[in-house]
Interface confidence: low
């Protein structure tokens, strides 16, 4: 093994390097010193480092490590952040289109139901958007509210247009009758199933992406332990104390140090792998009624069919509801 | 027969939005994201190695620093970590991750559980309990086409409704939508390319 080069007799090189880290040279010895106060760069002979320099090296080593960690995760972080934003916007576009398709269906096929239908449809799709973004709304309640609101308008405008406008009292009765008599057949239940399944999946997909960002942010801004700070200093800077400015750490040594410093972070690995594979499984299942794009953009058609179902059974329904809500109607006619 | 929104191109009950070259749907975008994420599946286990390869490490030099002295790169001394009498790596590894990492692990465990719960079996389109009152899940033919549901002749096929890189030229807002016909028969040119939502590399 070749003998190590003699230490810099005047600490000149060390001084000029250290000046870049810390302007002002008051901490750098003029000539090598025993260094008995050093705690990290334990000297084998005279050294060009002081305790204060060691502290500065530790701080710099820690900052280097934090920057390396951030640059390591930059591409991954960008990938998830941008996709989370893109999908959120895309889902909002889908909801907007679905609302517009449904409104257009009402305008083209049931103009007498507008503008009330527009209002109910708008409220429904606002709730859909809020649900996707994480609001604590029950999907079944959203669908029930849509049909509860629509039926009184359908009854008074399509099935029984002779009724006076002041239908406030009968409205409550009609809302109740809507569920009791299964006025829309099984369509509300069908829509509930499709909408709840597709929205749940969409919501969890967005939640998962946002958690991905949180995971990267957490590991991006980790503080490293003192022991780690010392090991990094030893690896990156202690050679300078001997005037060895150009030497680099041995590869195997670096790996041991990094594994020590990263012991906690590497713990995430198992759960990160599982996260990506579980997300893949979810994405593979996002079709048919688990694909909100598919479900929401077809809603106008199912709602249309549900109104047709009501119209088909209008005769029977009008008779039953006439009896059921007679009390409310009499009060209105007075 | 059903009436459709006038702003959609209707062809034999197959609902289409105008064809876009190199069309990119939401589902293809999702799959693309997963493929890219999978290239980062070993991100955390590879971090120590990544950081060493991106910080100054002796690669071509004959000599390297082992934490205590200058040694030959392939010597036994270089392989040792040069930490004896200094820091005990075992002591360093006694401890688990710091609290913020523990918290994020707990959150990952939770989301993984949710994701597994939500990963649905790829079977019938509708739940069995929806088949009462004459609703059939039906067979919609090829996998591209999705059954939206309906009753009897009300079954509709929807083919790739929303092209990912497109948006309707006008937003079908009811105020703007032409309302002079009951039966919808729009022309091809009523639908145009949407704005790009941005590419992720």
């Amino acid at each position: 093994q070749p003998p190590p080069p003699p230490p810099d007799a005047t600490c000149h090189q060390v001084r000029s390097f250290f000046q870049r880290l810390q302007p002002g040279l008051k901490w750098v010895p003029e000539t090598p010193v025993p260094g008995s106060d050093l705690q990290v760069c334990l000297p084998k002979g005279p050294t060009c480092c002081s305790r204060k320099m060691e502290e500065k090296y530790q701080l710099t080593a820690r900052l280097n490590m934090e920057q390396l960690l951030q640059s390591a995760s930059m591409e991954l972080k960008f990938l998830i952040i941008q996709n989370a934003a893109v999908f959120q916007e895309a889902f909002e576009i889908v909801v907007r289109h679905a609302k517009n398709y449904t409104n257009a269906m009402f305008k083209n096929n049931y103009p007498s139901l507008t503008p009330q239908a527009f209002e109910f449809v708008g409220e429904f799709f606002t709730d859909v958007s809020l649900y996707i973004l994480g609001s604590d709304i029950n999907v079944d309640d959203m669908v029930n509210e849509l049909f509860d609101s629509l039926f009184p308008v359908i009854y008074t405008q399509l099935m029984n247009p002779g009724l006076p406008d002041s239908a406030l009292d009968i409205n409550e009765c009609l809302r109740g009758a809507r569920r009791d008599l299964k006025v829309f057949g099984n369509f509300p239940k069908l829509i509930m199933t499709q909408v709840s399944k597709s929205l749940q999946v969409t919501r969890i997909f967005l939640q998962a992406l946002n958690l991905g960002i949180e995971v990267i942010n957490t590991t991006d801004h980790l503080k490293f332990s003192k022991d780690c700070g010392r090991m990094l200093t030893r690896m990156w800077y202690c050679s300078y104390c001997q005037g060895l400015m150009m030497v680099k750490p041995c590869g195997g040594y670096c790996n041991v140090v990094m594994q020590g410093c990263m012991a906690g972070v590497v713990e995430i690995d198992k759960y990160w792998r599982e996260y990506i594979l579980s997300l893949e499984e979810l994405v593979n299942g996002m079709y048919r009624i688990y694909d909100m794009e598919n479900v929401l953009l077809g809603l106008f058609s199912t709602i249309h069919d549900s109104i047709q179902y009501v119209q088909k059974n209008a005769g029977k329904l009008t008779t039953t509801i006439g009896k059921l809500c007679a009390h409310s109607q009499q009060r209105q006619y007075r | 027969s059903a009436y459709y929104p006038e702003d959609l191109f209707i062809d034999k009950k197959v609902l289409k939005v105008a064809h876009v070259e190199h069309e990119e749907t939401l589902s293809s975008r999702r799959r693309e994201l997963i493929q890219k994420l999978k290239s980062f599946i070993s991100f955390y286990s590879a971090l120590p190695g990544y950081i060493c390869s991106h910080s100054p490490v002796a690669e071509n030099d004959t000599l390297c620093w082992n934490g205590q002295e200058l040694v030959e790169r392939y010597s036994q001394k270089a392989a040792r970590n040069g930490m004896k009498n200094q820091f005990n790596l075992h002591e360093l590894k006694m401890k688990g991750p710091e609290p913020v990492v523990s918290q994020i692990i707990d959150k990952l465990k939770h989301i993984n559980q949710l994701l597994r719960t939500m990963s649905m079996p790829k079977g019938r389109v509708l739940d069995k309990n929806l088949d009462e009152e004459g609703f059939e899940s039906g067979d919609c033919g090829d996998d591209e086409d999705e059954c939206i549901g309906g009753s009897g002749d009300g079954m509709i096929k929807v083919k790739n409704q929303l092209r990912f890189l497109a948006e309707l030229a006008y937003d079908l807002d009811v105020d703007d939508a032409p309302g002079n016909s009951q039966q919808a028969t729009p022309k091809d040119n009523e639908i145009s390319t949407f704005h790009n939502l941005g590419n992720v590399h």
Partner: antibody, heavy 124, light 108 residues
Amino acid sequence: QVQLQESGGGVVQPGRSLRLSCAASGFTFSSYAMHWVRQAPGKGLEWVAVISYDGSNKYYADSVKGRFTISRDNSKNTLYLQMNSLRAEDTAVYYCAKEGTYYYDSSGYWDYYYGMDVWGQGTT
Amino acid sequence: DVVMTQSPLSLPVTPGEPASISCRSSQSLLDSDGYNFLDWYVQKPGQSPQRLIYLGSIRASGVPDRFSGSGSGTDFTLKISRVEADDVGVYYCMQALQTPWTFGQGTK
């Protein structure tokens, strides 16, 4: 809240074996080193063994080295102490204890700490 | 191994009076960062031990401010400014600087 519950104690003949368990709840078990400490009847506390958060590192008191084995199952949130070749002087109440938490110093570093901040009720 | 020696081994105190327990280690418990790796625990009759003080002087959460820890290197003291009836028990010091962790004999 954070809880540790030991079990598995009993009376056995010298030379025989026994396995103690410690069920943990209320904290992220897999993030903390865990200890066994014992107390002979009418005597003081004696530290027995410690295991790192992931089970990769274990340290023992000289009096039990080679006879006792500390282990953990993070999936079950359980700590174990396998005691072989038991002697009369091993008679004691055995406590499991969770190691202390991190502390931050003024420069923003966090550091390790190996004291014990939560103890179980003990098993004899 | 680091040997921990406590004194006195028994300390009768009247409620309302102060109390002081001493603990000495066979080698310094001060680490390079200036922390003393010494804990104080109390074991009340029929109960498990509980931590009072860690790192020489930091009170564990929930511990009344009547308790204080002081000292550095090899000499440490636990003080109770005003003893209450509930403070009856055996007090132990323990070093956590290196394995094996070692306890003092206890002060009753």
